[in-house]
């Protein structure tokens, strides 16, 4: 008789999840010499231990502490790029500008990027059928708690000038409910971070509006200023040209506004 299984509203665990995490860990530690000491089997065991046999709506940051400890990594604190609703361009940027880092350029972010996972209470099984949706089911699910935990730690580590890439095509360019708006903004440390510089990425080719004047950007400026951090904002009118100029800064066309 098949056992009754909780049906959640979100997609189930990504297929071949354990193999994917392990493979990503091995690949990452091979590419990054400073992480060669990491034992990927231990990393997987700690990852698994965070959610296996636990109710997928009752996960806490403490559950992930063993994994956080194993994945401790020092990135240059003044080279951090945050992003909101514009992941692909942020990652394209750090692939070119190799001395800057998004969360997904760190081991823990790289391991979990684009994956879904959850377990079941009192069984050692991974649930490949469905996992809790943040809105429809619960916020304390394995994926959401993971990203909240690593995002908080990433923001806490930042110093000097921190950059954030924001999607100018969205109705809310800055969204208080995004991970950036709800976690990272509030965990930047004013004793270390002097400035948050927002890069607002324009979508339309003919869009010449100053999106730094958008009400949601003004809201971000207000939140940041009250946290005793200076705020600055730049429009990136042509993201294609922006990336090209990062690759080839000597190009004569790169002196004009991007």
């Amino acid at each position: 008789v098949p056992r009754w299984r909780q049906q959640w509203s979100g997609p189930g665990t990504t297929k071949r999840f354990p193999e994917t995490v392990l493979a990503r860990c091995v690949k990452y530690t091979e590419i990054h010499p400073e992480m060669r000491h990491v034992d990927c089997q231990s990393v997987w065991d700690a990852f698994k231990g965070a959610f296996i046999s636990k109710h997928p709506c009752n996960i806490t940051e403490e559950d992930y502490q063993p994994l956080m400890k194993l994945g401790t990594q020092t990135v240059p604190c003044n080279k951090i790029l945050l992003w909101s609703r514009i992941k692909d361009l942020a990652h394209q940027f750090t692939q070119v500008q190799r001395d800057m880092f998004t969360l997904e350029d760190t081991l823990l972010g790289y391991l979990a990027d684009d994956l879904t996972w959850c377990g079941e209470f009192n069984t050692s099984k991974i649930n490949y059928q469905s996992c809790p949706d943040w809105r429809k089911d619960c916020s304390n699910n394995p994926v959401s708690v993971f990203w909240k935990t690593v995002s908080r730690r990433f923001a806490e580590a930042a110093c000097d000038v921190v950059h954030v890439m924001l999607n100018g095509s969205r109705s809310k360019i800055f969204d208080k409910n995004s991970t950036f708006g709800s976690v990272e903004v509030h965990n930047l440390q004013p004793e270390k971070v002097q400035t948050l510089e927002a890069w607002v990425i324009h979508g339309g080719r003919e869009d010449s509006r100053d999106l730094c004047q958008d009400p949601t950007i003004k809201e971000l400026e207000s939140i940041i200023s009250k946290r005793n951090i200076q705020f600055s904002c730049k429009n990136i009118y042509r993201p294609d040209k922006f990336l090209q100029c990062v690759k080839n800064p000597e190009d004569s066309s790169c002196t004009s506004e991007i």
């Epitope: 004013p190 002097q194 200023s225 009250k226 946290r227 951090i229 200076q230």
Partner: antibody
């Protein structure tokens, strides 16, 4: 109108204690970092303590740690500074100041603390 | 700690003069410098933020310039009500330190 009004200053003997208050109005007090800044008789300005907006974390210069305690009551829009084991060098005008983006945009009128026997 | 040095300590001027007050940081502080004015028996008030950004309500005769470790507060045409002490504030390292002040007096 944004207002900060300090009180609680006075004459106190060395080794004594004093509690300063700063009543605020005209803004959302809980949104802001708040500072105590003092001005010595020689007119030098120095920060004494500050408290963050969200988590209420507190910070002090190393020279004052353990003697001064800053706190806030967001429900009553009031900032406090508890000073103990006072020394003659603590004699100063004490200002409550609102901090935004690393500068002080609003100051109170100050309250005088004199430590003398 | 970053030390802020202001000069001169006292400046005697005639109304209508253009004056410059200097503030020097012991190391580069980028543009993290603010200026305050304190009149006799008053509390300090913000005059200029981030080296040169104006503050609403502050007369346009006040302006700021500089970068790195050398900064200047200029008063285009001094008026009698400008007498007082002017302080610079380093906000590069948070929390910050103040300069010793420059006293502006009218001859």
């Amino acid at each position: 109108e944004v207002k900060l009004v300090e009180s609680g200053g006075g004459l106190v003997q060395p080794g004594g204690s004093l509690k300063l208050s700063c009543a605020t109005s005209g803004f959302t007090f809980s949104d802001y970092y708040m500072f105590w800044v003092r001005q010595t008789p020689e007119k030098r300005l120095e920060w004494v303590a500050y408290i963050s907006n969200g988590d209420g974390n507190t910070y002090y210069p190393d020279t004052l740690k353990g003697r001064f305690t800053i706190s806030r009551d967001n429900a009553n829009n009031t900032l406090y500074l508890q000073m103990s084991r006072l020394k003659s060098e603590d004699t100063a005008m004490y200002y409550c100041a609102r901090s935004i983006s690393r500068y002080f945009d609003v100051w109170g009128a100050g309250t005088t603390v004199t430590v003398s026997s | 700690d970053i030390v802020m040095t202001q000069s001169p300590a006292t400046l005697s001027v005639t109304p209508g003069d253009r004056v410059s007050l200097s503030c020097r940081a012991s190391q580069s502080i980028s543009d993290f410098l603010h200026w305050y004015q304190q009149k006799s028996h008053e509390s300090p008030r913000l005059l200029i933020k981030y080296v040169s950004q104006s503050i609403s309500g502050i007369p346009s005769r006040f302006s700021g310039s500089g970068s790195g470790s050398d900064f200047t507060l200029s008063i285009n045409s001094v008026e009698p009500e400008d007498v007082g002490v002017y302080y610079c504030q380093n906000a590069h390292s948070f929390p910050s330190t103040f300069g010793g002040g420059t006293k502006l007096e009218i001859k």
